[in-house]
Interface confidence: low
């Protein structure tokens, strides 16, 4: 299988909810010896290898933002991500998403979704998707997020 992103750029006014989506395409291995992990993290833009660097989303690391079935895998030793305006969702068609509620410019960045396939006696396989979130400061709540299939290569000032 592979991971795709329906949109690679989201431009959202401050205060809106941003739902970033990834999709698993193709057959996923099944069986008692197969585990699929789905998670999210922030990374750096302008890298040659996208999604290499791991940064927390609103102080939550990728270990705390794992999808488990259709629900968020809660870690009792940490604050619930929902309390910090983060919600994870997934369906049976391979779509999974993270929603950031009440976004601020500090939420802007390159978001990566990661799917890890663990099979007994097989090497771990990792599949990535990436998308840019840009939050416009001081915009009214009347406008909504816009999603596009473009990468903003323009706002990266090249060396």
């Amino acid at each position: 299988f592979k991971v795709t992103t329906p949109y690679s750029l989201y431009v959202c006014p401050e205060g809106q909810n941003a739902t970033l989506t990834c999709r698993i395409l193709g057959p996923v291995s099944k069986g008692h010896d197969v585990t699929i992990y789905k998670t999210w993290y922030l990374s750096s833009r302008g890298e040659v290898q996208m999604c290499k660097e791991h940064r927390p989303i609103r102080n939550f690391t990728l270990q705390h933002l794992q999808h488990h079935g259709s629900h968020l895998k809660a870690n009792a030793s940490h604050d619930q991500p929902q309390k910090h305006g983060l919600e994870l969702a997934s369906d049976h068609h391979g779509n999974f998403s993270i929603t950031l509620r009440n976004v601020t410019p500090r939420d802007s960045g390159l978001y990566c979704c990661l799917v890890i396939e663990l099979k007994n006696h097989h090497p771990e396989q990792r599949f990535y998707g990436s998308m840019e979130l840009q939050v416009q400061a001081g915009k009214g709540s009347g406008s909504t997020c816009m999603a596009s299939n473009e990468q903003d290569s323009d706002s990266i000032t090249a060396a």
Epitope: L42, P105, S148, E150, D154, S155, I156, T157
Partner: antibody
Framework: EVQLVESGGGLVQPGRSLKLSCVAS????????MSWTRQAPGKGLEWVAS????????YYPDSVKGRFTISRDNAQNTLYLQMNSLRSEDTATYYC??????WGQGAMVTVSS | DVVMTQTPPSLSVTIGQSVSISCKSS???????????LHWLLQSSGRSPKRLIY???NLASGVPDRFSGTGSQKDFTLKISRVEAKDLGVYYC?????????FGAGTKLEMK
């Protein structure tokens, strides 16, 4: 060498329309967002419009939203700015820009009766 | 939108003098990748703006090292040491961390 060459400026009456063009060379045009930035006489710089690399999405400040339309022809390496319902406050030099890294020579637009 | 406040609005200098221009933003310009997308442009009389410094302190190609940029977060400075006649013009700070891009109002550098 990156080059951006604007054309289409001129004198126009309030309420009328004008279309600016910008021919780009020296870089892979269809890989980059492009923008228009303007400068009123004796004033500072103001972003006017941006367009994604395939032209799928466009962005405008409130001051021109609904009146200006940015578009592009990637086959011709050309960026456009269609300006409708022009007002005196739209009088400015309009620059075609690649980020803030590269700027065209500018096209002067004067809106006056 | 991010407001860029540039000071002073104008500077009268003599050739060989050193000067500094300040630029303050209404919010932090640090992007999530840790980089700060604050740039300095020069617009000479009757010309288009030209990039001098990108990402706070990096000199653009062909720019002499008499120009230097410093700062972090919301507070930035452009310093020109040993001003030459060709340095005269209007200096702008610009940010591309947040969409839309915004500019300072400019600082006019002129001969005393």
């Amino acid at each position: 060498e990156v080059q951006l060459v604007e054309s289409g400026g001129g004198l126009v009456q309030p309420g009328r329309s004008l279309k600016l063009s910008c021919v780009a060379s020296g870089f892979t045009f269809n890989k980059y967002w492009m923008s228009w930035t303007r400068q009123a006489p004796g004033k500072g710089l103001e972003w006017v419009a941006s367009i994604t690399n395939s032209g799928g999405n466009t962005y405008y400040p409130d001051s021109v939203k609904g009146r200006f339309t940015i578009s592009r022809d990637n086959a011709q390496n050309t960026l456009y700015l269609q300006m409708n319902s022009l007002r005196s406050e739209d009088t400015a030099t309009y620059y075609c820009t690649l980020g803030v890294d590269y700027w065209g020579q500018g096209a002067m637009v004067t809106v006056s009766s | 939108d991010v407001v860029m406040t540039q000071t002073p609005p104008s500077l009268s200098v003599t050739i060989g003098q050193s000067v500094s221009i300040s630029c303050k933003s209404s919010q932090s310009l640090v992007y999530s990748d840790g980089k700060t997308y604050l740039h300095w442009l020069l617009q000479s009389s009757g010309r288009s703006p030209k990039r001098l410094i990108y990402q706070v302190s990096n000199l653009a190609s062909g720019v002499p090292d008499r120009f230097s940029g410093t700062g972090s977060q919301k507070d930035f400075t452009l310093k020109i040491s040993r001003v030459e006649a060709k340095d005269l013009g209007v200096y702008y700070c610009a940010q591309t961390t947040h969409f839309p891009y915004t500019f300072g109002a400019g600082t006019k550098l002129e001969m005393k």
